[in-house]
């Protein structure tokens, strides 16, 4: 008996078409994506074949101007015109709190959502019960697959979950809901979620009982064969992962934002073994029409965003200093204020012990595009914004040794002077360089903002301790020349759209006045 | 659970036809086709034919002049039909799921006078 | 229609020994290859399907390997329970079986 698995992750906001790198759609002849066009695929496989399934794997949520605007309805209406099959919750459908999920999504979805390690208790749990499921048991066919959910038990730090949601470990949690489906004699089990690649492999191995593992979180890349776009495949698709007790058990994911399709097709004997496993993702590129119905919806939707992008956020009462010649050769303002706004972003009070989690942020100023004049009655719009942030990129939790937070520093100044955008912008760090220094040696003082303490003060860097940063998916992924950060990083999590993170800060505060004021010497 | 159980004649005399059933629990037929399979005593085991999922059905080409296989969807049931039985047919008859991952316990059916 | 070709066809060895039964197919069957055994009184299982996944309650003394054309079977530690006749069976087209291994007390 054969399956096809379509499978998402990771869409974040990607409801239009996008450019090749996930950006804002230029050239409509080049664009990828969108969920016109994903239906136009999905469809496509719908008719040519029996059974089956299109899951995601979370991560819907947060990512361009659509999240900001329409806060999770539109995932549900369009996920429902796709007919998604279930959904895996992910770290960032809880980016506008519990009731952000409930409302929007889980109360529109027609479609099951599933976490089988996320346990409600309190007065939540009576509110929320029966709108999430650990597992759900689909008809496919003159067959049933078990679908068990899972989320990064990470949420808590990389979103805003409450205090009334426990996120248990993945596979205590898995197991028995897994023995549960296998008391119900459902022998085809799919683990569906978003913890990671090495999560997803980890569950593939230890969880008896599953089948295949759709995943997300990760963004990873999986392909057999030569690539069809940029993206680099982190291994053969599907992944290939022995179970402790003797099963070869695929993984899969699909990479991110919509840009490609997962397709695989599994094989299954009559105990619901895998017997094969085969596929690839499928690029969604402008060989593939749009859908002319979903097109129209997208377009009728798209009205609001359009009145949205000119209305004032709250206003500077300071000139908002973005300029090429401040941020790439000093502390600017702009970049003080975006630093601010990512640690901002990021309060999570989930231990005593703590005042933050996370206290330091580093950007890179070329990556601030462009000031904003105080002297347009001081309004801030998102228009304003996305001239500053206009990659559509995200600001990502990642933890690095203070070795690697050293060298960045040292990086940053290592050519100063030729206007080059790898001069950093900071917050929760004070640095002070000699620039009359060799190259490498620049950094005479690099101070930090203390997490474990009630009282935030700086301390110096110690280079054997590992510290969390905010920083732009670009220097994540050794943007910049910033390989180091790339190639030591200990942990990263993606984040939330750059724009509106600064865009939340401005209307929280609603008058903003960000000074230089020593941060970088 | 998975089972396969074949039931039929113990004995079958020469030029008869045997008729055996193989009934299905646990998994359907609908999804799922059947092996049929014989090993003569002492002997090694040889492939006799199948049923697909779809009604469709495949034969051992030393076979195909005399045997047919059908089944009843609604009742779990697979039967196999071999016409012209020699002594040489004496076997055990196994029925076992399409991918072998379940078998039938086997019946030893005798053809003698 | 494909071929299989068992060997050894039969093998004496004692409890603790590591036992290796090889099958080479007439062409390349892509992995889908099976081995069961079969206990005296006649009873079919399947302990390995798809060339190295070990069928459920199957201990993890046996295990499977191969590609293209050449399959192996492999019990690491012989225990009494495990002297028996073994079996390869591709399923790539119709169904064949290899010879057989019975695998004796020394």
């Known amino acids: 008996w054969e399956l096809t698995i379509l499978h998402t992750n990771d869409v974040h906001s990607r409801l239009e078409q996008t450019s090749e790198d996930s950006s804002k759609c230029v050239n409509a002849s080049r664009c990828m994506g969108g969920v016109a066009r994903l239906f136009t695929k999905v469809q496509q496989i719908r008719r040519a074949e029996p059974n089956v399934l299109l899951l995601d794997a979370g991560d819907q949520y947060q990512g361009t101007i659509w999240f900001t605007v329409y806060k999770g309805a539109e995932v549900a209406h369009f996920m429902n015109a796709l007919r998604y099959d279930a959904m895996a919750l992910g770290n960032h459908e809880f980016d506008n709190g519990v009731e952000g999920l409930i409302e929007p999504l889980l109360k529109e979805a027609k479609f099951p959502i599933l976490s089988a390690n996320i346990k409600a208790k309190g007065p939540l749990a009576s509110q929320i019960s029966g709108l999430y499921l650990p597992y759900k048991v689909l008809p496919v066919g003159d067959e049933v697959v078990g679908i068990v959910g899972y989320t990064s038990k990470e949420t808590p730090f990389l979103s805003n979950p409450g205090t009334n949601l426990v996120f248990e470990d993945e596979i205590t949690a898995l197991q028995p809901e897994v023995d549960k489906l296998k008391t119900l004699n459902v022998n085809k089990i799919i683990a569906l979620g978003h913890s990671g690649f090495e999560m997803d492999k980890l569950i593939a191995q230890k969880v008896r009982g599953v089948d295949v593992v759709v995943g997300g979180h990760s963004n990873t890349f999986l392909y057999t064969g030569n690539p069809p776009s940029k993206e680099v495949p982190a291994g053969k698709y599907p992944f290939i992962v022995t179970s402790d007790d003797g099963r070869k058990v695929p993984v899969v994911q699909a990479y991110a934002f919509g840009k490609y399709l997962g397709y695989l097709k599994i094989e299954f004997d009559e105990r619901g073994n895998v017997i094969s496993s085969h596929g690839n993702p499928i690029l969604l590129n402008s060989s593939i029409p749009e859908d002319p119905s979903i097109k129209a919806d997208i377009n009728k939707w798209r009205i609001k965003l359009d009145n949205y992008s000119t209305q004032e956020l709250g206003k500077t009462i300071v000139y908002l200093d973005g300029s090429s010649q401040s941020c790439r050769f000093r502390e600017c303002n702009m970049g003080n204020l975006i630093c601010d706004a990512m640690i901002n972003n990021n309060l999570r009070h989930t231990d005593e012990m703590f005042w933050n989690h996370v206290s330091m942020c580093i950007l890179n100023g070329g990556g601030i595009r462009s000031p904003i004049d105080e002297r347009n009655n001081g309004t801030i719009t998102w228009e304003n914004l996305a001239a500053v942030l206009p990659f559509g990129g995200t600001f990502d939790l990642v933890q690095l040794k203070g070795s690697t937070l050293k060298k960045a520093f040292e990086h940053s100044v290592h050519r100063y002077g030729q206007s080059t955008g790898e001069f950093l912008q900071v917050g929760g760090i004070h640095v002070v360089y000699d620039l009359s220094r060799k190259p490498g040696d620049r950094v005479v003082k690099l101070d930090v903002l203390c997490t474990k303490c009630r009282v935030p003060s700086y301390d110096p860097l110690k280079m054997d301790e590992v510290y969390k940063v905010i920083l732009p998916n670009f220097l994540a992924n050794g943007g910049d020349g910033f390989q180091m950060i790339k190639d030591e990083l200990l942990r990263h999590d993606s984040g939330d759209q750059d724009i509106n993170v600064v865009s939340t800060y401005i209307s929280k505060m609603k008058v903003i006045y960000p000074a230089v004021e020593g941060r970088i010497k | 659970e998975v089972t396969l159980k074949e039931s039929g004649p113990v004995l079958v005399k020469p030029t008869e036809t045997l008729t055996l059933t193989c009934t299905v629990s646990g998994f359907s037929l609908k999804s799922y086709g059947i092996q049929w399979v014989r090993q003569p005593p002492g002997k090694l085991l040889e492939w006799l034919g199948v049923i697909w999922s779809g009604g469709s059905a495949d034969y051992n080409a030393a076979f195909i002049s005399r045997l047919t296989i059908s089944k009843d969807t609604s009742k779990s049931q697979v039967v196999l039909t071999m016409t012209n039985m020699d002594p040489v047919d004496t076997a055990t008859y196994y029925c076992a799921g399409q991918y072998g991952s379940v078998w039938g316990q086997g019946t030893l059916v005798t053809v003698s006078s | 229609d494909i071929q299989m070709t068992q060997s050894p066809s039969s093998l004496s060895a004692s409890v603790g020994d590591r036992v290796t039964i090889t099958c080479r197919a007439s062409?390349?069957?892509?992995?889908?290859l099976n081995w069961l055994q079969q206990k005296p009184g006649g009873a079919i299982k399947r302990l390995i399907y798809?060339?190295?996944s070990l069928d459920s309650g199957v201990p993890s003394r046996f295990s499977g390997s191969g590609s293209g054309s050449e399959y192996t079977l492999t019990i690491s530690s012989l225990q009494p329970e495990d002297f028996a006749d073994y079996y390869c069976?591709?399923?790539?087209?119709?169904?064949?079986f290899g010879g057989g291994t019975k695998v004796e007390i020394k």
């Open positions: 798809a060339t190295s």
């Open positions: 062409q390349d069957i892509g992995d889908r």
């Open positions: 069976l591709q399923y790539a087209g119709s169904w064949t």
